[in-house]
């Protein structure tokens, strides 16, 4: 990950360092997982496309009483600090499949690593 740390990207997009910090936090969660993450809580799966950070936040915020993912929730809020207006990113609340938080985190981590390798920080 480090070799892409200085990748320059135009416009208001999450800088590489912010993305790397989020990746590292997700890595910490997956590596330090002993008991089922968040007691096996289920969350809505999301489309890992446009509006992904807001969608991930909206999904994970439904897990309560799980300190292991609170930092992740707050870091995702860094990308998406104000509520998405109605009609914007309509996929945010498409709810059809639920998965365990642990699987959600793994899927998100894999996707973010892929974006990082490709230099896509938005």
């Amino acid at each position: 990950l480090t070799c892409l740390g200085g990748f320059a990207s135009p416009g208001p997009v999450p800088p590489s360092t912010a993305l790397r910090e989020l990746i590292e936090e997700l890595v910490n969660i997956t590596q330090n997982q002993k008991a089922p993450l968040c007691n096996g809580s289920m969350v809505w799966s999301i489309n890992l496309t446009a509006g992904m950070y807001c969608a991930a936040l909206e999904s994970l915020i439904n897990v309560s009483g799980c300190s292991a993912i609170e930092k992740t929730q707050r870091m995702l809020s860094g990308f998406c600090p104000h509520k998405v207006s109605a009609g914007q990113f309509s996929s945010l609340h498409v709810r059809d499949t639920k998965i365990e938080v642990a699987q959600f985190v793994k899927d998100l981590l894999l996707h973010l690593k892929k974006l990082f390798r490709e230099g896509q920080f938005n």
């Epitope: 999450p14 929730q73 707050r74 809020s77």
Partner: antibody, heavy 118, light 111 residues
């Protein structure tokens, strides 16, 4: 320990400009959104602007077009450029770490005073 | 804009007693079952401090004497039991709709 230190306040005439700065430490600055919130003398709190970790900006109508929020992640610094200042902009301006709409303004600086008067 | 009306404007409470502050929003601040209402404490000469987020969640490091409740348009901050150093102004704030707005504040004094 999270620390936010504002500077740049002072006395300015109506129509003038001022640039506020906020030096952040004790957390990974680049990973968090930041905001400015102000408090007029003896009054309540008013949200002034926010900026995401990626640089997206948000303003209320009261300052839109006059104020510009920006950040320098390399310097762990937040800025507020204030133009066309009015008497009603007189306030203590606080820099705050914004943990998003689900968590609120998690940490606040001590504030810097802006006085707009002729 | 969403208007937040706090009551009472001020109250005096004896140590050990309960203090209750209410915040009424001009429209619902709920978002998919989550109330986007937060509470702050501001002691004299100091910046505000986050106490409660999302109506009822205690921010890290805040004593359990503070609690929040409510949903939709009606919210409550409770301090029980009140201590001498709780003298401060308390503000509610909504983040459901831009522009984000604060209540007018409630001044709590300890008898």
């Amino acid at each position: 320990e999270v620390q936010l230190v504002e500077s740049g306040g002072g006395l300015v005439k109506p129509g003038g400009s001022l640039r506020l700065s906020c030096a952040a430490s004790g957390f990974t600055f680049i990973s968090y959104a930041m905001s400015w919130v102000r408090q007029a003398p003896g009054k309540g709190l008013e949200w002034v602007s926010s900026i995401s970790s990626g640089g997206n900006t948000y303003y209320p109508d009261s300052v839109k077009g006059r104020f510009t929020i920006s950040r320098d992640n390399a310097k762990n610094s937040l800025y507020l450029q204030m133009n066309s200042l009015r008497a009603e902009d007189t306030a203590v301006y606080y820099c705050a770490r914004l943990d998003g709409y689900y968590f609120g303004f998690a940490y606040w600086g001590q504030g810097t005073t802006v006085t707009v008067s002729s | 804009d969403i208007v937040l009306t706090q009551s009472p404007a001020s109250l005096a409470v004896s140590p050990g007693q309960r203090a209750t502050i209410t915040c009424k929003a001009s429209e619902s601040v709920d978002n998919y079952g989550k109330s986007l209402m937060h509470w702050y404490q501001q002691k004299p000469g100091q910046p505000p401090k986050l106490l409660i987020y999302r109506a009822s969640n205690l921010e890290s490091g805040v004593p359990a004497r503070f609690s929040g409740s409510g949903s939709g348009t009606d919210f409550t901050l409770t301090i029980n039991p009140v201590e001498a150093n709780d003298t401060a102004n308390y503000y509610c704030q909504q983040s459901n709709e831009d522009p984000w707005t604060f209540g007018g504040g409630t001044k709590v004094e300890i008898k």
